[in-house]
Interface confidence: low
């Protein structure tokens, strides 16, 4: 069947539409288009004859129509008047007529809408606002958006006038939003620019900050007032009902108790004509004096003196607090507080008690701290240390020794060589030394405040020939798989190479062997019994070399699991039983025996003469190494059979 399809069906003004013919018969004479729902010569648009391929305009032809060989009709530059029905009249080859009608609708391209308002400054909870979407357009749908969202459901929102007008009843500050309207028709949709609703509101009850109402005398009072308001509120301050100033902040420096009272902030909105006030009560407390610390001993001597620190001034009904090193007082038997906490006594001061110490006075609002106090504890001198630690020097080098002893006040130093005073300096320097400079070098440290002196003596040897070294050990009896041993080659000498041998061989490569301290120290980690060998150290320089006597490492080990011999377990009655127990151990272990769990003798050998079947049972050997603290044991079963009944062995 012949049909007409309009593409598109809804056409925008100025655009074009194609009336597309479907199921056109094959053999045609011609066809003609008419405006309307029927064939009417007065409303013919165009006719077309196939044979002549001639198109003839009709009375309704506007010059905007184009006819195609397939009978489709294109109408360009569409106007509103083009809306409606179009009829195709087809004359077939057999001159039989056929008709089909199609239609389309024309809509204008919508202009960008705008929003008009009946009230640009509505007052909260009082006014209504009516937004109207302009212009009024026929066949258009009106939509509204608030903050780019569709309208919320609210009894205060009402659409009217075909949704063209949006009314907000009893506006609130929350209605301050971006409003947009949109117009739609089948061919276009346009959205307006946003309109921001400026709702006048407030002032709300003002808030005064900060919230604290208690102050100390001498502080600055700085109160700030804020009230939600549009336009911004104008502020006034009243103290005890008396007007002060018209500012948002009230500042009173260096307040006194007389500034206590009621402080009122008044907020005024000139547009809404409303006033709101908030009152806060401020209390000013008298300022207590700043505390300070007095001491009964400003220069106490370590381990001799006690010090009493007192928090001044004395104030009745006051809480005193103490801090040491910015921490509350530690629990210590050497720290004592008086009943009122005002006096802190340090018994037998040490150099670690220097502080700082602070005391505090607590009042209604806060704690006032004293300035910190530091104790000058006199101590020392401790035993001086002489550096460097070398004891052997070659002739011709410079000898430079430095002495230091912990001391307060700093120690005064003196040097003696072989008991003869040399100089009163912390450092001793002798250039180009010879063998004659060998001797006993003594550093004496003296504390003038405490009157104490301490000395350290060091033997210095000056020799071209290296001395015979010796080996010192930090552990003479290490335990296997537990201890480490550090061998040190003595003496320490300048410009000297240190070497090591084990059982006459150079050191084996082993993760358990480590050289340090310029190869002067050999450390054996996790010693084993195999480390019980002869260790020799050697020293050499450009002119001489020397080796120490060997030192054999005495490794304590064991006891290992003992062995009972002979291995036999079957015996004939009447034989002698002679069991010997042995366990690898250093030192030799202590042995003991148990037969069937009953303790016997503490010997390495167990002897029983002329055994009988009564001697059947379990024989246990127990070994114990008192040096390693370790124990071990083994159990053996012995069977004794009557003579001639068992092929056992006789002892």
């Amino acid at each position: 069947k012949l049909t007409i399809e309009s593409t598109p069906f809804n056409v925008a003004e100025g655009k074009e539409v194609l009336l597309l013919v479907h199921n056109l018969p094959q053999h045609l004479f011609g066809y003609s288009w008419y405006k309307g729902e029927r064939v009417d010569g007065n409303r013919q648009i165009i006719g077309y004859v196939i044979g002549t391929q001639q198109a003839t305009p009709g009375p309704a032809y506007s010059g905007r129509e184009i006819i195609y060989p397939n009978a489709s009709l294109l109408i360009q530059n569409i106007i509103q008047n083009d809306t409606g029905f179009y009829t195709l009249h087809v004359i077939k080859s057999d001159l039989v007529n056929e008709e089909a009608t199609g239609q389309f609708r024309v809509y204008p391209e919508l202009p960008k809408p705008s929003i008009s308002s009946n009230n640009s400054k509505p007052v909260e909870d009082k006014d209504a606002v009516a937004f109207t979407c302009e212009p009024e357009t026929q066949d258009a749908t009106y939509l509204w958006w608030v903050n780019n969202q569709s309208l919320p459901v609210s009894p205060r929102l009402q659409l009217s006038n075909g949704n063209r007008t949006l009314t907000l009843f009893n506006v609130t500050r929350n209605d301050t939003a971006s409003y947009k309207c949109e117009t739609q028709n089948p061919v276009s949709a346009r959205r307006s620019d946003s309109v921001i609703l400026n709702v006048l509101y407030g002032p709300d009850a003002p808030t005064i900050s900060p919230l604290n109402t208690s102050y100390r005398s001498g502080e600055n009072l700085n109160l700030s007032c804020h009230a939600a308001s549009n336009p911004p509120a104008q502020y006034s301050w009243f103290v005890n009902g008396t007007f002060q100033q018209s500012t948002q902040e009230l500042f009173i420096p260096n307040i006194t108790v007389n500034n206590s009272g009621s402080y009122t902030c008044q907020a005024h909105n000139s547009d809404t004509g409303l006033n709101r006030t908030t009152v806060t009560t401020i209390t000013v407390y008298a300022e207590p004096p700043k505390p300070f610390i007095t001491s009964n001993n400003s220069n106490p001597v370590e381990d001799e003196d006690a010090v009493a620190l007192t928090c001044e001034p004395e104030i009745q009904n006051t809480t005193y607090l103490w801090w040491v090193n910015n921490q509350s007082l530690p629990v210590s038997p050497r720290l004592q507080l008086s009943n009122d906490n005002r006096t802190l006594t340090l018994l037998s001061v040490t150099r670690n008690d220097v502080g700082p110490y602070e005391c505090g006075i607590q009042n209604e609002l806060s704690v006032d701290h004293s300035d910190p106090v530091i104790l000058n504890v006199l101590y020392g001198p401790d035993d001086p240390t002489i550096s460097p630690s070398y004891t052997y020097y070659r002739p011709g080098v410079n000898l430079s020794l430095s002495c230091h002893a912990a001391s307060n006040p700093p120690a005064q130093y003196s040097w003696l060589i072989d008991g003869n005073i040399q100089q009163h300096t912390q450092e001793l320097f002798i250039s180009n030394i010879t063998e004659k400079n060998s001797g006993l070098y003594t550093c004496q440290a003296n504390n003038s405040a405490s009157g104490h002196s301490r000395t350290t003596v060091k033997t210095i040897t000056v020799s071209a020939e290296l001395p015979k070294p010796s080996i010192s050990s930090n552990n003479s009896k290490p335990v296997e798989d537990k201890d480490a041993v550090a061998f040190t080659c003595e003496p320490e000498a300048q410009n000297t190479t240190y070497l090591w041998w084990v059982n006459g061989q150079s050191l084996p490569v082993s993760p358990r062997l480590q050289l340090s301290n310029g190869n002067r120290t050999l450390t054996l980690f996790n010693v084993t019994r195999n480390d019980a060998r002869a260790y020799v150290c050697g020293i050499q320089n450009s002119v001489s070399a020397n080796r120490s006597d060997p030192v054999t490492l005495d490794v304590l080990y064991g006891p290992d699991t003992p062995i009972i011999s002979p291995p036999d377990s079957s015996y004939l009655s009447g034989a002698n039983l002679n069991l010997s127990c042995h366990s690898a151990s250093n030192p030799s272990p202590q042995y003991s025996w148990r037969i069937n769990g009953i303790p016997q003798q503490h010997t390495q050998v167990l002897f029983i003469a002329k055994i009988t079947p009564n001697n059947n049972g379990t024989y246990a050997c127990f070994v114990s190494n008192l040096a390693t603290g370790r124990n071990n044991s083994i159990v053996k079963s012995i069977t004794v059979s009557a003579s001639g009944t068992s092929p056992g062995l006789s002892a």
Epitope: Q234, S246, F251, P253
Partner: antibody, heavy 121, light 106 residues
């Protein structure tokens, strides 16, 4: 005589930080609101930030919010502007200025001579 | 934020002329508007605050008017020292400035 003296400006790389100071004298600093205003080369004045007399109330332009911090030390009569994450568009002469305590209309009655901040790599 | 628009952006006039500069706010700011004068190499100077209040020490030939969204700065008789850039500033929050009007010698 009211005097405001800015310091701390200079050349800094993008992303860097700078702290401007403004030493005030000749008026009761502790009771005055203070502010910072800047002028970029070839541009107009731009308000940057303001602070209440007791540091309770601070306000910032959107262009510097989250990067700049205004503060004051009333004991030293000094206003500060800590500028972090600096950008090339922060290049400007920065003025320190005073808001007097006149009811209902904030305005800047005294200005410093300004300090130049240049943000460039 | 409130936007401030000044017009004209530049203006040529002669000594003795009467000059008017306008400033428009994007929303009502009541009478919270200030005017400043800035000369090259110098700090800005306050002329008018609260739309119409003359700052102490400023010559009376400067005057301000307006409220809501439209404001005017008038110089009744231009003097040689008046050639400068003029800025309006709204005193709501934040305290934004207009883009400036450059007053030049004709």
């Amino acid at each position: 005589e009211v005097q405001l003296l800015e310091s701390g400006g200079g050349l800094v790389q993008p992303g860097g930080s700078l702290r401007l100071s403004c030493a005030a004298s000749g008026f009761t600093f502790s009771s005055s609101y203070m502010g910072w205003v800047r002028r970029a080369p070839g541009k107009g004045l731009e308000w940057v930030s303001s602070i209440g007399s007791g540091s309770y109330s601070t306000s910032y332009a959107d262009s510097v919010k989250g990067r700049f911090t205004i503060s004051r030390d009333n004991s030293k009569n000094t206003l500060y502007l800590q500028m972090n994450s600096l950008r090339a568009e922060d290049t400007a002469v920065y003025y320190c200025a005073r808001y007097p305590s006149v009811p209902f209309s904030p305005h800047l009655d005294y200005w410093g001579q300004g300090t130049l901040v240049t943000v460039s790599s | 934020d409130i936007q401030m628009t000044q017009s004209p952006s530049s203006l040529s006039a002669s000594v003795g002329d009467r000059v008017t500069i306008t400033c428009r706010a994007s929303q009502s700011i009541s009478s919270y508007l200030n005017w400043y004068q800035e000369k090259p190499g110098k700090a800005p100077k306050l002329l008018i605050y609260a739309a119409s209040s003359l700052q102490s020490g400023v010559p009376s030939r400067f005057s301000g008017s307006g409220s809501g969204t439209d404001f005017t700065l008038t110089i009744s008789s231009l003097q040689p020292e008046d050639f400068a850039t003029y800025y309006c500033q709204q005193a709501g929050n934040p305290h934004t400035f207009g883009q400036g009007t450059k007053l030049e010698i004709k």
